[in-house]
């Protein structure tokens, strides 16, 4: 019997999307590249449920993790990597006192209970996101794909 695997091996399924939590570290820009290389995007958060799921994943592992949010284009104007603005309702997720832009901190990370802005050059873990396969048409969607890990080889 063929099984439906909506996500590649080592990816996590949640509400119609697949998420990859890296085990290595890259700066924010290289994290974007790593996600693109596997047909995904540095995570853009669309709902409170998704935010809670991702925050939990990050805090459980006690890792500081890049998301696809920055104010690099215009200081103080936070924008997702897909070009959408940060909605006012999402500003509650910043940790107390954040974002503070201390020392030009222009990229957002999952930091414990909430979000923090930090220097984009710093190497951190990252989360990629892509749509899950529907498992309705293509033969390949019924097969577990080969591992798709955007991690570089260990140093």
């Amino acid at each position: 019997e063929r099984l439906c695997h909506p996500c590649p091996w080592e990816w996590t399924f949640f509400q119609g999307n697949c998420y990859f939590m890296s085990n290595s570290q890259r700066n924010w820009h290289d994290s974007i590249t790593a996600c693109k290389e596997v047909g995904a995007q540095l995570v853009v958060i669309k709902s409170a449920e998704e935010q809670n799921f991702l925050q939990l994943q990050s805090s459980r592992s006690n890792r500081f993790t890049w998301m696809g949010l920055s104010d690099l284009n215009q200081e103080g104007t936070w924008q997702w990597v897909d070009g959408s603005p940060l909605l006012p309702s999402f500003k509650q997720y910043w940790n107390r006192g954040e974002p503070n832009n201390v020392g030009e901190e222009d990229c957002a990370e999952f930091s414990g209970n909430g979000w923090n802005d930090d220097k984009c050059n710093l190497a951190k873990f990252w989360i990629c996101k892509k749509s899950a396969a529907s498992c309705s048409r293509d033969e390949e969607q019924f097969l577990s794909p080969a591992p798709a890990t955007p991690n570089p080889p260990p140093a």
């Epitope: 570290q25 890259r26 700066n27 290289d30 805090s59 006690n62 890792r63 500081f64 993790t65 940790n95 107390r96 006192g97 954040e98 020392g103 030009e104 930091s111 414990g112 209970n113 909430g114 923090n116 930090d118 220097k119 050059n121 710093l122 190497a123 951190k124 873990f125 140093a155």
Partner: antibody
Framework: QVQLVQSGAEVKKPGASVKVSCKAS????????INWVRQAPGQGLEWMGW????????NYAQKFQGRVTMTRDPSISTAYMELSRLRSDDTAVYYC?????????????WGQGTLVTVSS | DIVMTQSPLSLPGTPGEPASISCRSS???????????LDWYLQKPGQSPQFLIY???NRASGVPDRFSGSGSGTDFTLKISRVEAEDVGVYYC?????????FGQGTKLEIK
Amino acid sequence: QVQLVQSGAEVKKPGASVKVSCKASGYTFTGYYINWVRQAPGQGLEWMGWINPNSGDTNYAQKFQGRVTMTRDPSISTAYMELSRLRSDDTAVYYCARENSGYGKLFDYWGQGTLVTVSS
Amino acid sequence: DIVMTQSPLSLPGTPGEPASISCRSSQSLLHSNGYNYLDWYLQKPGQSPQFLIYLGSNRASGVPDRFSGSGSGTDFTLKISRVEAEDVGVYYCMQALQTPYTFGQGTKLEIK
């Protein structure tokens, strides 16, 4: 594998300056702060400051302000710590350490240390 | 500056027995993100320091599970469930909440 290799031992006279190097390998040099920590003979650890190898931004402990200068050369993945107006109580082993911000501010790799002796 | 105080400063350890080190900070190390910015390091004789625990209670990769960290705010503890001969050295706590980062005086673990 990640390595921080420091320059060799130095003997200096009071009032002179010393410059210690820390060559990084096995990782992206610009992605992690380099901290400098010293240890006087038989004593504990003392934080001196950090440098962001990407931007060159620094943060020095007040105690060393005006005497310490931290620099870097990304082209050779090397950080430097220069301490001027040396005194006998600056005799210590000086360590560089990589700060891993993926785990908070953990110093996950340390150099082997450079002994600086200040003696007339 | 945040002052870090360790006790005891000297700790005789018996192989196979537990050991415990206390670290107190002059102000809370609890960040608004919920993490305590307190790390533990071990400096073995003649070596550079090495990491053990980060963010108060998280064992770093490759650290034996006999080491554990606990505590929050201003009071922290490093426990070794069963001391081994290779655990000898000086243990330091370090606060990384704010600069200047500061270390405890160190606790020297020796085997009885």
